[in-house]
Interface confidence: medium
């Protein structure tokens, strides 16, 4: 056997080339058939009424042909025959690639709730051979589970994702991408996450900064409240007592002025929005004015109905005057 | 409790094709986010991923062996095949199966634990 | 794909030390991490995922912490049967990577 042909896989609607090559050339007739087995070229004459067909190179060597907007239906094998005694004959497999022609990302719901599990589906139509599809939250690559529908040689794969939301996704892209031989670089859409969550509530000491509370000092607190949406309500209480007359309440801010000790107690920010309602304490000890030693604690307790970790912000008196705050994990 | 085993030849010949076993018991791999990884490691060197396979048949490959690569189970006998062409002295290593771990069972990500005793491939002619 | 690089590839402690493993991702990873424990012709064990997350069953002087591309495994009370080589691993994205390897020696 003298007679060679190379497999062919090219994208629809792009050329592809076929190439009878003979080893040891005896000026033997060659020609090509088409899986149908009708005559391409015989030697450098085309019978078959194909213009798509043209004659890139003829010798006694090689019949060289190119075959220009391949589509499926042209997929199949190609003979080269050589008019040798016996005459010998071999094939080329010509496999056409059709890219997906569309890339549908599909998220069950706009808006989720923190904890929900939402369902993604992605859809590569219509490609030849099936689509891998591949999922991202931001770059962290997911798991999904993929179906794939043949009809007429062609397959559309339908990627479903199950993700659990939480308050860090928000933002974040799901990224549905496409891996297939007729794609080069990336092929891929994506959707953003909006997820809702309860808020988070923080108080800051902003007055005294030293954050040592004296008879007859002011005390000023501010409450810092996230979530989303933004919270409506940030509400001051004193949790098991009235708020003290002299107390003054600004939107987030609480103050309170000419402190003293029946104002010693537990000071709570609450706060809530549509998913849920959370709130932070603060302990507020009143020490004696500086003629007297103060004992080493004022103690900031942050709690919410999400999270079991305490913060504490102790002021450490071993300076003198000047308190250094630590925050301490509980 | 978790159990796996790897068999196979510890002998190639360069340009063979290396088939091994990993015969496991504990749990099933038609149970929903459970998978099976094979990993690595040249006498002396680091660990290297090679393949994973999932219980709903999908396979993942390290792009850099991809080609030689094939991963298969069969989970009525509980055991994953991995099947590595046109082998080469450099291929020469312990070779590991190892259980899947997973949070989520939407987390593609994997750690692996436990893992097979190993078994050393040596590539010579 | 992910290189992840270990240091130092290997240092020398004694058994009572406080011993820190560093492991650095070339790209963020959260926190899709896990480590590992090897001894010699044995298999790997796993130690910590998550990043910081105790696999069962392994002592709690063994902790982990880190998240995006930088990571540590700290040894806090380094017993006799610690003495081995210890590897990370991400799990963010294929393909799944190890680091080089950290030896740790009886000094």
């Known amino acids: 056997q003298n007679l060679f042909t190379k497999d062919v896989t090219v994208i629809e609607g792009e050329v592809a080339t076929i190439s009878c090559q003979v080893n040891k050339s005896d000026d033997s007739v060659i020609q090509l058939l088409n899986p149908n087995r009708q005559t391409i070229y015989f030697r450098d004459f085309r019978p078959l009424k194909d213009s798509r067909f043209q004659l890139l190179n003829f010798s006694s060597s090689e019949l060289k042909v190119s075959l220009t907007n391949v589509s499926i239906s042209d997929e199949g094998r190609y003979f080269c025959q050589l008019y040798t005694d016996p005459p010998q004959e071999s094939y080329t497999t010509i496999t056409v690639l059709v890219p997906p022609r569309n890339l549908m990302i599909d998220i069950q719901k706009d808006t989720a709730v923190e904890g929900e599990e939402i369902e993604v589906n992605c859809t590569a139509m219509a490609s030849k051979p099936a689509t891998t599809i591949r999922w991202f939250k931001g770059n962290t690559e997911l798991k999904g589970k993929s179906e794939v529908e043949e009809w007429s040689d062609m397959y559309t794969v339908t990627s479903q994702l199950m993700l659990k939301v939480h308050k860090e996704d928000d933002g974040v892209p799901v990224i549905c991408q496409v891996e297939h031989p007729a794609v080069t670089g990336n092929l891929q859409t994506q959707r953003y996450l909006e997820v809702q969550y309860k808020p988070q509530v923080h108080i800051q000491m902003t007055y005294p900064l030293q954050g040592l509370t004296r008879e007859g000092d002011a005390l000023e607190l501010t409450c810092e409240a996230i979530g989303k949406p933004q919270p409506v309500m940030v509400t001051w209480v004193r949790v098991d007592d009235e708020m003290p007359q002299h107390a003054v309440l600004s939107g987030p801010n609480l103050f309170i002025n000419n402190l003293n000790k029946t104002d010693n107690g537990t000071y709570r920010c609450e706060a809530s929005n549509i998913v849920g309602k959370a709130h932070s304490d603060y302990m507020l000890y009143v020490y004696d004015p500086p003629t007297t030693i103060p004992p080493p604690t004022t103690t900031t307790t942050t709690t919410t109905t999400t999270t079991t970790t305490i913060l504490t912000i102790i002021t450490d008196s071993r300076a003198g005057e000047e308190g250094s705050i630590r925050a301490v994990d509980h | 409790q978790i159990t796996l085993k790897e068999s196979g030849p510890t002998l190639v010949k360069p340009t063979q094709t290396l088939t091994l076993t990993c015969t496991f018991s504990?749990?099933?791999?038609?149970?929903?986010?459970?998978?099976v990884g094979w990993i690595r490691q040249p006498p002396g060197k680091a660990l290297e991923w090679l393949a994973l396979?999932?219980?709903?048949?999908?396979?993942r490959y390290s792009p850099s062996l991809k080609s030689r690569l094939t991963i298969t189970k069969d989970t009525s006998k509980n055991q994953v095949v991995l099947t590595m062409t046109n082998m080469d002295p450099v291929d020469t290593a312990t070779y590991y199966c190892?259980?899947?771990?997973?949070?989520?069972?939407?987390?593609?990500?994997?750690?692996?634990?436990?893992w097979g005793q190993g078994t050393l491939v040596t590539v010579s002619s | 794909d992910i290189q992840m690089t270990q240091s130092p590839s290997s240092l020398s402690a004694s058994v009572g030390d406080r011993v820190t493993i560093t492991c650095r991702a070339s790209?963020?990873?959260?926190?899709?991490l896990a480590w590992y424990q090897q001894k010699p012709e044995k298999a790997p064990k796993s130690l910590i995922y998550a990043a910081s997350s105790l696999q069962s069953g392994v002592p709690s002087r063994f902790s982990g912490s880190g998240s995006g591309t930088d990571f540590t495994l700290t040894i806090s009370n380094l017993q006799p049967e610690d003495f081995a080589t210890y590897y990370c691993q991400q799990y963010n994205s294929y393909p799944l990577t190890f680091g080089g390897g950290t030896k740790v020696e009886i000094k």
């Open positions: 790209q963020g990873i959260s926190s899709w």
């Open positions: 504990g749990f099933s791999l038609s149970t929903s986010g459970v998978g």
């Open positions: 190892a259980h899947r771990r997973v949070e989520w069972v939407t987390l593609a990500g994997n750690w692996f634990d436990p």
């Open positions: 396979i999932y219980w709903d048949d999908d396979k």
